[in-house]
């Protein structure tokens, strides 16, 4: 997260760290007792590694009573996700067992109504991704409030030049932005999950390259079918 601040500890009990061989790889969001939603591209290079999900965490390194690392029983990338596109960049991870819920571990309601969030709406994005252009990784969860950007502006040639489909949304990126390591994490508007941070090599913090988020409402049928 660029231009953000440290989150209040455990105030986002839905927040997950998707880990590869014990190290933070991507963000994720608990959407059901046994399911974490993240980004499909996160697991592209994870073929031989051990994927786990950390819940109830604020610090990645310090012991915390609510922290627990879960093995992954099943990883379900969206069937249409592809390495070279930002489209359909969703992944559902089934935990090896139902998460132990409590004040620091709780699923987040996700948007089912397929309607765009109004431009200018302030949404919260959180993660353990890099906090500066030098690539410094934080130990504690960071967050930032970002205004939603209308899709037409996001599709301008100087922004994302037509790449933003109706299944994607954008948020402003003027110094405050999600960044590398935040992929798969939640974009929360009015207490509801609206978007998932897309993965990729997008430049962060440049106002002409807005953050891109997968709209969960557009994938309600798929999410429901996997969770069923």
């Amino acid at each position: 997260i660029l231009g953000g601040r440290e989150a209040e500890a455990h105030a986002r009990p839905y927040m997950a760290s998707v880990q590869l061989n014990g190290a933070h790889l991507c963000g994720g969001v608990l959407v059901a007792e046994q399911w974490v939603l993240s980004a499909a591209h996160c697991l592209e290079d994870a073929a031989d590694g051990k994927v786990q999900v950390l819940l109830g965490a604020h610090s990645l390194s310090q012991p915390e009573p609510s922290k627990r690392l879960y093995d992954v029983l099943r990883a379900v990338p969206h069937p249409d996700s592809q390495p070279d596109t930002i489209d359909h960049d969703l992944l559902l991870l089934q935990l090896s067992e139902k998460a132990t819920l409590g004040p620091a571990v709780r699923p987040l309601p996700w948007q089912r109504v397929d309607r765009d969030v109004a431009p200018g709406t302030l949404c919260d994005v959180a993660g353990w991704g890099i906090v500066n252009h030098a690539g410094r990784r934080p130990d504690s969860l960071q967050h930032v409030l970002l205004p939603v950007l209308d899709r037409a502006t996001c599709n301008r040639r100087t922004h994302h030049d037509g790449a933003i489909t109706e299944r994607l949304m954008c948020a402003e990126s003027n110094r405050r932005d999600s960044c590398k390591g935040d992929s798969g994490g939640p974009l929360v508007c009015g207490g509801v999950l609206e978007g998932v941070v897309t993965s990729g090599s997008r430049v962060c913090g440049n106002r002409k390259k807005p953050g891109i988020y997968t709209r969960v409402a557009s994938y309600a049928a798929w999410i429901d079918s996997v969770l069923a």
Epitope: R151, A152, N206
Partner: antibody, heavy 116, light 112 residues
Amino acid sequence: EVQLVESGGGLVQPGGSLRLSCAASGYSFTSYYMNWVRQAPGKGLEWIGDINPVTGDTDYNADFKRRFTFSLDTSKSTAYLQMNSLRAEDTAVYYCTREGPSFAYWGQGTLVTVSS
Amino acid sequence: DIQLTQSPSSLSASVGDRVTITCRSSQTIVHSNGDTYLEWYQQKPGKAPNLLIYKVSNRFSGVPSRFSGSGSGTDFTLTISSLQPEDFATYYCFQGSHVPVTFGQGTKVEIK
């Protein structure tokens, strides 16, 4: 299939007005800026300006700002170009073109002839 | 406003020829985001323009590989490696980095 269809061109007297329409189909109208470009007979392409179909924000080439106005009817997925105080030198084919990717999608153009 | 000057204004060539069109801008067209929004369009009589090249050197989908773009800063080139009968048309460069966006005056490619 993305389609842009202009209409409303024709013969108009100097000093007169005309409203051109650009009907869009095959995509979500509010997801892309609409631009207007014109081309005088035997001449090059000239950018008139653009409009954001979500916010209605506009940007005009300074040469056209006082006489030309963009508007929208999102329920009809249509953009409009209102042209006032027309002069002989406004005689041209007028195109609408979607921005994103680049100007990949254009209408067929509509001819406006300003003559007495 | 940024002026784009194309040269030549017109040229005669034969099928199979290699054709080069240049476009010079009156100032740099590198955008504040670091990208250069220099595009090339092809237009045939009575038709709307067609996008060939975007961001200096990227071919738009469906554009034949004989079309290529290059350049940086203020000097840009469109090359047709082996001219085909359907390539006889007018070509325009365009800059989208700075408002107002502008087109070059065009280069007409005619049959020799």
